[in-house]
Interface confidence: medium
């Protein structure tokens, strides 16, 4: 009888673990959807506001190819940085290539020197995978150096010509990115 009870208890515990896993997956999926939604809204907002503007990038933004970049002059934690960028119809910088990384680090050297700048990279709490804000994975050459020993959530930032990682709750400058307006001919 006792054995039967303990077997039932173990089965119930297993069920509970499975439900917790499902809930975690759902929460992650919901978070991902919310971010995707914000990302689309930012893109739409940018497209609409750009339509009323003749220059490819807004004032104080730097252009490189199809992108406009804004290097902040204030410090924020990572999440606030992302919110600040979204308010401007942009997202935190997503570095797609070594060429883009070189442009960013070269521009930063000219503008401000060797500070820390948040980019749109964060580490998934469960899998430990690095993800850009649109849900994509960075290319192998653009993974942050393992620098943070933080037990808290970890996010990516640029310093000098390196991509590094740090506790998302520390304050840093940040870089926003949005599409440059194509000039209509």
């Amino acid at each position: 009888k006792l054995l039967q009870v303990s077997t039932i208890a173990m089965q119930q515990q297993e069920k509970l673990i499975q439900q917790e896993r499902a809930l975690l997956n759902f929460t992650e999926w919901k978070r991902s959807c919310a971010l995707q939604m914000k990302y689309c809204q930012a893109f739409m907002q940018n497209s609409l506001s750009s339509a009323h503007n003749s220059s490819p990038c807004p004032n104080n933004w730097i252009q490189n190819r199809e992108s406009c970049y804004y290097v902040s002059e204030i410090w924020s934690i990572w999440h606030t940085s992302q919110e600040n960028c979204l308010k401007e119809g942009s997202t935190l910088l997503q570095i797609e290539s070594k060429e883009e990384m070189d442009f960013i680090t070269g521009s930063l050297r000219k503008i401000k020197g060797s500070y820390d700048y948040w980019v749109g990279l964060s580490q998934d709490g469960h899998s430990g995978r690095w993800l850009w804000q649109d849900g994509s994975s960075p290319s192998p050459g653009l993974l942050p150096a393992e620098r943070s020993q933080s037990a808290n959530q970890v996010c990516g930032y640029v310093k000098s010509n390196s991509l590094l990682s740090s506790n998302c709750s520390t304050w840093k400058y940040f870089i926003c990115e949005k599409y440059a307006l194509r000039s209509s001919v």
Epitope: S72, I74, T80, K87, E88
Partner: nanobody
Framework: DVQLVESGGGSVQAGGSLRLSCAAS????????MAWSRQAPGKEREFVAR????????DYADSVKGRFTISRDNAKNTVYLQMNSLKPEDTAIYYC??????????WSQGTQVTVSS
């Protein structure tokens, strides 16, 4: 128009204390994070401390951790920087700033702090 006026700077011996104040007028600062930074002669301006709008979150440069304390009184629209155990390397012009993404240029005029050994 927003104005940030500082007070409390001056000269002090190493190991001494100073309390800087930054009073804002023309805007309620309770919605904004506030920061202190400093610039020593011939060096870049560096981050010193920051406090969230509600005052529940603070952050410090490693060089001042444990010695400096940032605080705010939203009713008085003022931010403070309590500086203890001052060192000669703390000598700089100290600035406060409203951390407003859309208006990043709200810096104070700066107040001189000189620490002699």
């Amino acid at each position: 128009d927003v104005q940030l006026v500082e007070s409390g700077g001056g000269s002090v011996q190493a190991g001494g204390s100073l309390r800087l104040s930054c009073a804002a007028s023309g805007r309620t600062i309770s919605n904004y994070d506030m920061a202190w930074s400093r610039q020593a002669p011939g060096k870049e301006r560096e981050f010193v401390a920051r406090i969230s709008g509600s005052g529940d979150r603070t952050d410090y440069a490693d060089s001042v951790k444990g010695r400096f304390t940032i605080s705010r009184d939203n009713a008085k629209n003022t931010v403070y920087l309590q500086m203890n155990s001052l060192k000669p390397e703390d000598t700089a012009i100290y600035y406060c700033q409203i951390q407003d993404f859309r208006s990043p240029d709200f810096w104070s005029q700066g107040t001189q702090v000189t620490v002699s050994s």
